[in-house]
């Protein structure tokens, strides 16, 4: 047979204080006068009792009825309930891309580059000791790297013979031209580094 | 040799309108922020507004002073930055720096700045 | 806005003095500040970035240092033609904003 509601709400008492009863599937739910709280509005209302202030905000009461939450940095919203986005400001370096976090941001870089603002080169010569073959030489740079070619081998990683006429000649490959000048090693903060 | 040129600083009227330019050479303009920063005679350092470079799609930021009534552009096949200033202010009254942003968090390369006087 | 409060607005010093100006600012700023020397009439120069690192061509007299929100620029030994006044700013994020300066004056 069809379940029918029972409309708890036919049998009085159950929301106290001039409640007003809301009946529910299968329950019922008590709307509180100012004042009153609780399941059954069986309790005073204390506006910082428990405090309604989330993500570590700290309530005040401001009235009998009213209260004011006081966010901690990175947070907003009447009850602290919404993190701040912080990317509209950020500040990411060498091609890196926001990332919010809360009262700051992170940086998402591209593979040459690492640290919070992507402002540390990553030194690829350490991270591929092969990457340049045949006694090549290999040479970090800002946003790249490059290999030095020993006399005989030319090409991107000195793949590449040459010619016996051409052998005097050494070849510095640029792996990726960027014209950043400097590397740069954020100290402390290493938790929110975020390598790549 | 990384140099930035500014020009288009000169006398106008309360309310009236200034382009200024920025002319950069010695390298890639389109990989890195650029500043607009002024400082009133006497004063300290003020930011005014900034582009982003193209990875981070040339986005814009003004500082609340300026925040719609001056607009930043870049000419990437003229390697020129601009600043249009509309409704001026005696208080913008000021030398306009351009100012390139180095990749690390600071501004290494500075324009020899304009003069924008806003006057009746 | 990050606030930058920077001590002292002034100084008189001799040739051969230690010379300590601070920045201070509102919230950690990850050691993302620069120090910039203006002398009369001339733009800003970068000196320090990234709270302790030499720009290219600065003299090694030059030196910062700190983290968080106290940050410190030195110079050991002032020269003739490091009279001029000095900025601290924080590039952690827009608005980039900048200490009030302080002028180094011939004592």
């Known amino acids: 047979g069809s379940e029918t509601d029972v409309n708890e709400c036919d049998i009085p008492g159950h929301c106290q204080h001039g409640g007003t009863c809301l009946n529910l599937p299968g329950s019922y739910q008590c709307q509180c006068l100012q004042g009153f709280t609780g399941q059954y509005c069986d309790s005073l209302y204390v506006p910082c009792a428990p405090s309604p202030c989330v993500n570590g905000g700290t309530c005040r009461q401001t009235g009998d009825f009213t209260f004011e939450c006081n966010c901690l940095p990175g947070f907003e919203g009447s009850t602290c309930e919404r993190n701040i986005d912080d990317c509209p400001n950020h500040r990411c370096q060498n091609g890196g891309v926001c990332v919010d976090g809360v009262n700051t941001y992170n940086c998402r870089c591209p593979p040459q580059w690492t640290g919070q603002f992507c402002t540390e080169d990553v030194d690829e010569c350490l991270l591929q000791p092969n990457a340049c073959q045949n006694g090549g030489t290999c040479a970090n740079r800002n946003g790249g790297y490059g290999c030095v070619c020993v006399n005989g081998w030319s090409g991107d990683d000195c793949s590449e013979n040459i010619d016996d006429g051409n052998s005097g000649l050494n070849d510095i490959f640029e792996a990726q031209k960027i014209e950043w000048h400097e590397n740069l090693y954020f100290q402390g903060h290493h938790h929110h580094h975020h390598h790549h | 040799e990384v140099q930035l040129v500014e020009s288009g600083g000169g006398l106008v009227q309360p309310g009236g309108s200034l382009k200024l330019s920025c002319a950069v050479s010695?390298?890639?303009?389109?990989?890195?922020?650029m500043e607009w920063v002024r400082q009133a005679s006497g004063k300290g350092l003020e930011w005014v507004a900034a582009?982003?470079?193209?990875?981070?799609?040339?986005?814009?930021v003004y500082s609340a002073s300026v925040k719609d009534r001056f607009t930043i552009s870049r000419d990437d096949s003229k390697s020129t930055l601009y600043l249009q200033m509309n409704s001026l202010k005696t208080e913008d009254t000021a030398v306009y720096y351009c100012?390139?942003?180095?990749?690390?968090?600071?501004?290494?390369?500075w324009g020899q700045g304009t003069l924008v006087t806003v006057s009746s | 806005d990050i606030q930058m409060t920077q001590s002292p607005s002034s100084v008189s010093a001799s040739v051969g003095d230690r010379v300590t100006i601070t920045c201070q600012t509102s919230?950690?700023?990850?050691?993302?500040l620069a120090w910039y020397q203006q002398k009369p009439g001339k733009s800003p120069k970068l000196l320090i970035y990234?709270?302790?690192r030499l720009q290219d061509g600065v003299p090694s007299r030059f030196s910062g240092s700190g983290s968080g929100t106290d940050y410190t620029l030195t110079i050991s030994s002032l020269q003739p033609e490091d009279f001029a006044t000095y900025y601290c700013?924080?590039?952690?994020?827009?608005?980039?904003?900048f200490g009030g300066g302080t002028k180094v004056e011939i004592k």
């Open positions: 582009q982003r470079n193209k990875a981070n799609d040339f986005s814009i």
């Open positions: 990234g709270a302790s």
């Open positions: 700013q924080q590039g952690f994020k827009y608005p980039l904003t």
């Open positions: 919230e950690d700023i990850y050691s993302g």
């Open positions: 010695g390298f890639t303009f389109s990989d890195f922020y």
């Open positions: 100012s390139r942003d180095g990749g690390k968090l600071a501004l290494d390369a």
